[in-house]
Amino acid sequence: LPKAPVITTPLETVDALVEEVATFMCAVESYPQPEISWTRNKILIKLFDTRYSIRENGQLLTILSVEDSDDGIYCCTANNGVGGAVESCGALQVKMKPKITRPPINVKIIEGLKAVLPCTTMGNPKPSVSWIKGDSPLRENSRTAVLESGSLRIHNVQKEDAGQYRCVAKNSLGTAYSKVVKLEVEVFARILRAPESHNVTFGSFVTLHCTATGIPVPTITWIENGNAVSSGSIQESVKDRVIDSRLQLFITKPGLYTCIATNKHGEKFSTAKAAATVSIAEWSKPQKDNKGYCAQYRGEVCNAVLAKDALVFLNTSYADPEEAQELLVHTAWNELKVVSPLCRPAAEALLCNHVFQECSPGVVPTPIPICREYCLAVKELFCAKEWLAMEEKTHRGLYRSEMHLLSVPECSKLPSMHWDPTACARLPHLDYNKENPKTFPPMTSSKPSVDIPNLPSSSSSSFSVSPTYSMT
């Protein structure tokens, strides 16, 4: 007789480990024989899906190699056309040994910041996560905590937090260890011992001492009056993350010496600075070998003319060289207000570069005179009329003060850049600019009174100032 299907062994919850076999049994009594279908999470399992095996007329469903994604509710439905279809359901719980899905990585962190070492895990039952530092379990404290995700968070990182870390994931089925990672704590450069200021006699030796620390160990550079130290010897030693630098100087001029400690954190740098002054006792005493010293121009009159941070020569034949030289240019500058627009910028450039001569390294301290070619360009091209008038006034004794004469160079007594291009300073303001031909002045000059060689044209732009000489 026909008999409606009855499921005699309802499905039960099945526990299975990943990669193991899991089987659901759905025993059915009926006549005629029923059709049995299987679903997972209400989605039909296809008969030809090779991950499954369906046997015993559909009463046995076997998952051949369990994956963690196989978790879910499995149902069997039996139908033979007699009465209604019957269904039984059971859960598959995929059990999984702990697995670290996002292991920690090496971290470099600056002291005082927050560090997070990731450790994301999988597993069923859910693994508990702990951390090992070095060889010992890490104890949580007010700065250290293991987050819900398993990651380790360290607030206000300190030098002592540096070391080797690994995370451990544990459940009833086993334990997983991450690879060992390194937490490196970097520390901003800091000066431990600043150089001391000195007041010394001319020609004596002075040692400036600067000590700094940081992680990585900083490098120390010395700056003299805003420029890299050009003379003196530097000795350095490093011990226990402390760098010790000694700058030995032969003192021929006063100066401001700055010790700069720098270290690198990724793409960024941290810097610490400390400065000391070296002044010279009895500085006013004339020294045969030292007619002045080099320092950055701090005046106002020549600011627009001299290069930014220009290193200029200060003549110690004056009691206060900076003030005296500034007064010199100031006085002459006022007289230039009446000259032609063509002459004025050229004369201002000549004036400032003559009174505040550029300083040369090499044999220190030495001023570099203006190149004869540039002086002649001002005298015979830009300011021919004005120069002539000034010379006439001088011959007739119309100038009350000798002061302005100091600010006007005698072109014939200046070196030519033709014979030694490093012997003299050029006046960039006077150079002809090919991009802007309007800057080329009209030719008002005859042959110069001083023979100047014909200069060969060079690769740089050249400005022909007269038929007999050019400025390159």
Epitope: G226, A307, S360, P361, G362, A423
Partner: antibody, heavy 115, light 113 residues
Amino acid sequence: EVQLVESGGGLVQPGGSLSLSCVASGFTFSLYYMNWVRQAPGKGLEWLSVIDTHSIAYYADSVKGRFTISRDNVKNTLYLQLNNLKPEDTALYYCVLGRTALVRWGQGTQVTVSS
Amino acid sequence: EIVLTQSPNSVTASVGEKVTINCKSSQRVQLGSNQKSYLNWYQQRPGQSPRLLIYYASTQQSGIPDRFSGSGSATDFTLTINSVQPEDAAVYYCQQGYSAPFTFGQGTKVELK
């Protein structure tokens, strides 16, 4: 045209002295720094000394205290006085015009120190 | 004193090839205030006096062919001979004019095949 002509070289015994001269022409000598550079046989160049326009001199450590540079701006002449000579001072000695670059060189004068 | 180290010590090239000579300084030879590098290059042909090719690291001395060029700043400098010619067979020296005592590199010999 700049010309620098050295003279005064020769053979001298160790411990002896020599005076080298360099006559300059074609430029205003007094306005320029002047140098002495030497080259030992088959060796590289060695800078010895420079004298500035105020006759202030600077020397290489290897010759300090033994060699003296000087100039006579009236005679347009540069000098190098060599004292207490050693065999390792054997070289071709060049007179050179230049401040921070050595721009124009003479042909050199040979100094040989040998017993 | 400032030590200058040239590389290579010697180089052999064919006519038309590019030759590069390096010069490394033990200290900066660049002045912060004017950004000039006080580094010069010289050529010394066999049996001749040296001649200045390049000053301030990259400025060509007058009368020097355009195939000679200099580059670099602070401590690392290069002399380049583009399309080397038979007359370029010589020893090349770098020299610093930044700090007395002025010093030279040991020299680089350029030979032609």
